[in-house]
């Protein structure tokens, strides 16, 4: 379906508002350090150009690819070399290498200040004074901090952001109305960003076969009544959408996502009985709703898989004729029967089945060789079941903060070379699995927990790739996507690690501790805990608990003192000395 002008085609399909929003997101994700005003100027220039192409598709430059147009525009930024260093070298390349170069320079951990939320009245005034600028600023600030955020979904977040201000700035108690909504958007946004980052990592590091396998498993769980051919069609379309978004082709991605939503709503009868309420909604909400839709009910009386995948004499013939289709059908059949399994477990089972067929179909008696293949599945199923059970019991016993601390200790002992801020961020997020998943009914715990852990561990992998410090992390991150979590779970205390020298400065605290929020206090204490473990990796739980209890007592005492700073100066060295003695 070729068009004389790609930019005109996308402008007409998406409409001006979405076009401008997506171009702003694209530019902000590529040039993460540029000021807002610079991006707005670039977007306005691109939009005016797009309008000339809509008026006359054969006008000059209208036939150029979007990568060429956008890349040329980015390369006009005057301060490119000073701000981005070697990223400026991308501009010497031709497409498609130039776009690949920009993609490689996306920074998952940009050195940007944390977003500070102004007073509610200040925000409401800014919203009323210039709503358009206010919303563009939101897109810009989120996109530059999350360079792989799923762009069409970010437009949905912006629409909710706008709705929250429109409603709450009229309310009697603006803050009571607005702040919970903003907190919810922030938390959902972070989760959405992390989930999308895993999809992009899957596509970029492991290829579209890995992503398609993930999608077959997930969509088969969601749509167990759909035929395999229907699931395959959805998987193909979804893979195209995410490949485009992960590749920076945000206009094509948003357009194709809208087409996919349209197709799903036109074909509900052959997909799922749960789509109805999504399909009545406007586009952005509809696409979001379809992505989050609950699993349909499993058809009754599904037969055992043994007949087709073990007992049949044609297993090797069917496998040899079309390996990926046969494995895809296996995965579909397994997944539609098991919404209680994590997607990662289902992929491990498919991988084990594939390995057995590769071995057995070359054997003298293939049938005899693969006859007991499903016995190999039992330990694969029971390992995450036991892990979820044990960790949920620990979470219920300790509560979230102490559960996070247990994970901090566990992961610092496994990979002590990883930077302290990364260990704190990742372990805190790993610890959130408890509140998120352990309260769920048993049938939903494993898919919630293990697939969430995959998302969090991907964050560790992405940060570690930027600054690699641990061979063990590199190995777990790169060897197998589906075995990342079991790989990290299996890591033990790193015996080769040379303990970090004690640095009193790391354990020196001041009166500013007292004015921190509860979350910030926790992060400070957890940072100290990681440093303690790096200093004494063989410290026992009891020793560490003792030191942390003393730390909490010392901070509480000084924060109650009249002269807080004097208290910290006097009690701090005592705490450090006592801690060293306790860990000696």
């Amino acid at each position: 379906d070729t068009h004389k002008s790609e930019v005109a085609h996308r402008f007409k399909d998406l409409g001006e508002e979405h076009f401008k929003g997506l171009v702003l997101v694209a530019f902000s994700q590529y040039l993460q350090q540029c000021p807002f005003e610079e991006h707005v100027k670039l977007v306005n220039e691109v939009t005016e150009f797009a309008k000339t192409c809509v008026a006359d598709e054969s006008a000059e430059n209208c036939d150029k690819s979007l990568h060429t147009l956008f890349g040329d525009k980015l390369c006009t930024v005057a301060t490119l070399r000073e701000t981005y260093g070697e990223m400026a070298d991308c501009c010497a390349k031709q497409e498609p290498e130039r776009n690949e170069c920009f993609l490689q320079h996306k920074d998952d951990n940009p050195n940007l200040p944390p977003l500070v939320r102004p007073e509610v009245d200040v925000m409401c005034t800014a919203f009323h004074d210039n709503e358009a600028t206010f919303l563009k600023k939101y897109l810009y600030e989120v996109a530059r901090r999350h360079p792989y955020f799923y762009a069409p979904e970010l437009l949905f977040f912006a629409a909710r952001y706008k709705a929250a201000f429109a409603e709450c700035c009229q309310a009697a108690d603006k803050a009571a109305c607005l702040l919970p909504k903003l907190d919810e958007l922030r938390d959902e946004g972070k989760a959405s960003s992390a989930k999308q980052r895993l999809k992009c990592a899957s596509l970029q590091k492991f290829g579209d076969r890995a992503f398609k396998a993930w999608a077959v498993a997930r969509l088969s769980q969601k749509f167990p009544k759909a035929e395999f051919a229907e699931v395959s069609k959805l998987v193909t379309d979804l893979t195209k959408v995410h490949t485009e978004c992960c590749h920076g082709d945000l206009l094509e991605c948003a357009d194709d996502r809208a087409d996919l939503a349209k197709y799903m709503c036109e074909n509900q009868d052959s997909i799922s009985s749960k789509l109805k309420e999504c399909c009545d909604k406007p586009l952005l909400e509809k696409s979001h709703c379809l992505a989050e839709v609950e699993n349909d009910e499993m058809p009754a009386d599904l037969p055992s898989l043994a007949a087709d995948y073990v007992e049949s004499k044609d297993v090797c013939k069917n496998y040899a004729e079309a390996k990926d289709v046969f494995l895809g059908m296996f995965l579909y059949e397994y997944a539609r029967r098991h919404p209680d399994y994590s997607v990662m477990l289902l992929l491990r089972l498919a991988k084990a089945y594939e390995a057995t067929l590769e071995k057995c179909c070359a054997a003298a008696d293939p049938h005899e060789c693969y006859a007991k293949v499903f016995d190999e599945f039992q330990p694969l199923v029971e390992e995450p079941q036991n892990l979820v059970k044990q960790n949920c019991e620990l979470f219920e016993q300790l509560g979230e903060y102490k559960f996070q601390n247990a994970l901090l200790v566990r992961y610092t002992k496994k990979v002590p070379q990883v930077s302290t801020p990364t260990l704190v961020e990742v372990s805190r997020n790993l610890g959130k699995v408890g509140a998120k998943c352990c309260k769920l009914p048993e049938a939903k715990r494993m898919p919630c927990a293990e697939d969430y852990l995959s998302v969090v561990l991907n964050r560790l992998c992405v940060l570690h790739e930027k600054t690699p410090v641990s061979e063990k992390v590199t190995k777990c991150c790169t060897e197998s996507l589906v075995n990342r979590r079991p790989c990290f779970s299996a890591l033990e205390l790193d015996e080769a690690y040379v303990p970090k020298a004690f640095n009193a400065e790391t354990f020196t605290f001041h009166a500013d501790m007292c004015t921190l929020s509860e979350k910030e206090k926790q992060v400070k204490k957890q940072t100290a805990l990681v440093e303690l473990v790096k200093h004494k990796p063989k410290a026992t739980k009891e020793q560490l608990k003792g030191v942390m209890d003393n730390f909490a007592a010392f901070v509480e005492k000084c924060c109650k003192a009249d002269d807080k700073e004097a208290c910290f100066a006097e009690e701090g060295p005592k705490f450090v000395a006592a801690s060293q003695a306790a860990l000696a």
Epitope: M298, D340, F374, Q378, E442, A443, K444
Partner: nanobody, 116 residues
Framework: EVQLVESGGGLVQPGGSLRLSCAAS????????LAWYRQAPGKQRDLVAR???????YYADSVKGRFTISRDNSKNTLYLQMNSLRAEDTAVYYC??????????WGQGTLVTVSS
């Protein structure tokens, strides 16, 4: 294979309650759907309630609002809580397990008699 053993049947007055249990053993890791069926004297075996691996439940119209099916995977046990029992609920109740890798399994049945 999966083995199933029912318990909890007995004689109960109309309006009373009973709780049936079904203990599964063997290849329980492979179970996806569990169900209760019943067979009244001289009748065919009918589905009473079903619970899938995802936790979704289905009830026959005749027991909706009175019976509750549940499963405890950690104990490998299926339950059927039966309230407001009626004479027409008298039957042998069978536990059924649908497996992903093995043939379906049936228990030997437990008799429930509702009579005054």
């Amino acid at each position: 294979e999966v083995q199933l053993v029912e318990s909890g049947g007995g004689l109960v007055q109309p309006g009373g309650s009973l709780r049936l249990s079904c203990a599964a053993s063997g290849s329980t890791w492979s179970i996806n759907t569990l169900a209760w069926y019943r067979q009244a004297p001289g009748k065919q075996r009918d589905l009473v309630a079903r619970i899938s691996s995802g936790g979704s439940t289905y009830y026959a119209d005749s027991v909706k609002g009175r019976f509750t099916i549940s499963r405890d995977n950690s104990k490998n046990t299926l339950y059927l809580q039966m309230n407001s029992l009626r004479a027409e609920d008298t039957a042998v109740y069978y536990c059924y397990a649908q497996s992903t890798w093995y043939p379906p399994s049936w228990g030997q049945g437990t008799l429930v008699t509702v009579s005054s």
